[in-house]
Interface confidence: medium
Amino acid sequence: CEAPPTFEAMELIGKPKPYYRVGERVDYKCKKGYFYIPPLATHTICDRNHTWLPVSDEGCYREMCPHIRDPLNGEAILANGSYEFGAELHFICNEGYYLIGKDILYCELKDTVAIWSGKPPLCEKILCTPPPKIKNGKHTFSEVEVFEYLDAVTYSCDPAPGPDPFSLIGESMIYCGNNSTWSHAAPECKVVKCRFPVVENGKQISGFGKKFYYKATVMFECDKGYYLNGSDKIVCESNSTWDPPVPKCLKVSTSPTTKSPTSSASGPRPTYKPPVSNYPGYPKPDEGILNNLDD
């Protein structure tokens, strides 16, 4: 017989020879990182027809790492379904908890023993320190020292000492989030008051009032013979200025060579699209917890 078969999990005991006599026996042992479980044979014999009797390495099993339990308030997931060396164990924490330690352990071979690459991690409860205090305002649960995951606080503004109220700029409600930080920056309480918007040769058609506070919205149209240069809708923004700027009503030219803009009485529609649903002096209704303040 020629050289005996080779296997992934099993190796020849002794040096192989180029040829073997009929009836000659060779023995195998499990390779490093594998261990033998009887009863399958680990030897073969050179048969009379010059072939080796059937033999397999199915009795050699990969070394296994010790079983690791799910961490408290988390889960250990085997990436490839077994604890054999080469395995990966992934750790995740339940909602409201964060991982301390490595999120993946590897089953490695040290000498002939399969061991994990490190200590299993822990899942600790997500906690936040109290949210920021704000000038001219307060938040709920101000006496609480530690907040748990998803605990929320609501900010409100104090009554103003003068005639104009404080407006809340930003998110009124923030919550303790994934990485032990608050979901948004604390809002600001300040007096936001825009100047009375005067449009010569035009008139206000909505948003009437003597005072214009945060998010106050005013709409205009021009007198007959004038067209609107700018937006027909303006909003009082947090820096006490109108956005977009107060428009102008310009006279429609009667010169036969000049083509005036085709328009209704209020002039061409602006391309600027104002925010939806505003109410003076309050946060936009389209802002709430989980939203982006930087939009």
Epitope: L150, T154, P285, D286, N291
Partner: antibody, heavy 116, light 109 residues
Framework: QVQLVQSGGGVVQPGRSLRLACAAS????????MHWVRQAPGKGLEWVAV????????YYADSVKGRFTISRDNSKNTLYLQMNSLRAEDTAVYYC?????????WGRGTLVTVSS | QSVLTQPPSVSGAPGQRVTISCTGS?????????VHWYQQLPGTAPKLLIY???NRPSGVPDRFSGSKSGTSASLAITGLQAEDEADYYC?????????FGGGTKLTVL
């Protein structure tokens, strides 16, 4: 025009899956938290799921946890609700809604009927 | 069974004032979380009516007002009109969950 246009409803057998879509126009979905709310025939409103503006936080009602997945495709400005292992009690009109603590813009709703 | 409790129905004659109550607990309304109200006209999607306890979005008539005290909130409608006939829902928040009341059907007699 600021609006939410919904699609994807229909009749489906128990145990099967369905995906609802909600296309936004007039604003960008990845600047806002987006929710799904449902209403069973003749019943009240029930909150289903929310995805935060950055997509990092997703919360679900206990009744759908592990079966429904909320997601967003920013390039299409569209919100999705993947509904697996559907049950008869999931039969409802499903609304998508914009906003965080409250919902200031709603889709028109799409009917999902789970029946054998 | 809803976590926020509303009366199933209320009614009033045109021009009258009606109120709809919404009772929660110390873990939602009583914890300081805002209460919001939605109006749902027959066959349509809900519409935001009141946000943050007592604020009206633009376009909502000042006949509608909201208030909150302790673990309860209420919606008041003055000068009742035929077009106010609808279902009304209160809503609030508790850790990781948005809550709705069971809804109240308002009938204008």
């Amino acid at each position: 025009q600021v609006q939410l246009v919904q699609s994807g409803g229909g009749v489906v057998q128990p145990g099967r899956s369905l995906r609802l879509a909600c296309a936004a126009s007039g604003f960008t979905v990845n600047n806002y938290a987006m929710h799904w709310v449902r209403q069973a025939p003749g019943k009240g409103l029930e909150w289903v799921a929310v995805i935060s503006y950055d997509g990092n936080n997703k919360y679900y009602a206990d009744s759908v946890k592990g079966r429904f997945t909320i997601s967003r495709d920013n390039s299409k400005n569209t919100l999705y609700l993947q509904m697996n292992s559907l049950r008869a009690e999931d039969t409802a009109v499903y609304y998508c809604a914009k906003g965080g603590g409250y919902f200031d813009l709603w889709g028109r709703g799409t009917l999902v009927t789970v029946s054998s | 069974q809803s976590v926020l409790t509303q009366p199933p129905s209320v009614s009033g004659a045109p021009g009258q004032r009606v109120t709809i109550s919404c009772t929660g607990s110390s873990s939602n309304i009583g914890a300081g979380y805002d209460v919001h109200w939605y109006q749902q006209l027959p066959g349509t999607a809900p519409k935001l009516l009141i946000y943050g306890d007592n604020n009206r979005p633009s376009g909502v008539p000042d006949r509608f007002s909201g208030s909150k005290s302790g673990t309860s909130a209420s919606l008041a409608i003055t000068g009742l009109q035929a077009e106010d006939e609808a279902d009304y829902y209160c809503s609030s928040y508790t850790s990781g969950t948005w809550l709705f009341g069971g809804g109240t059907k308002l009938t204008v007699l």
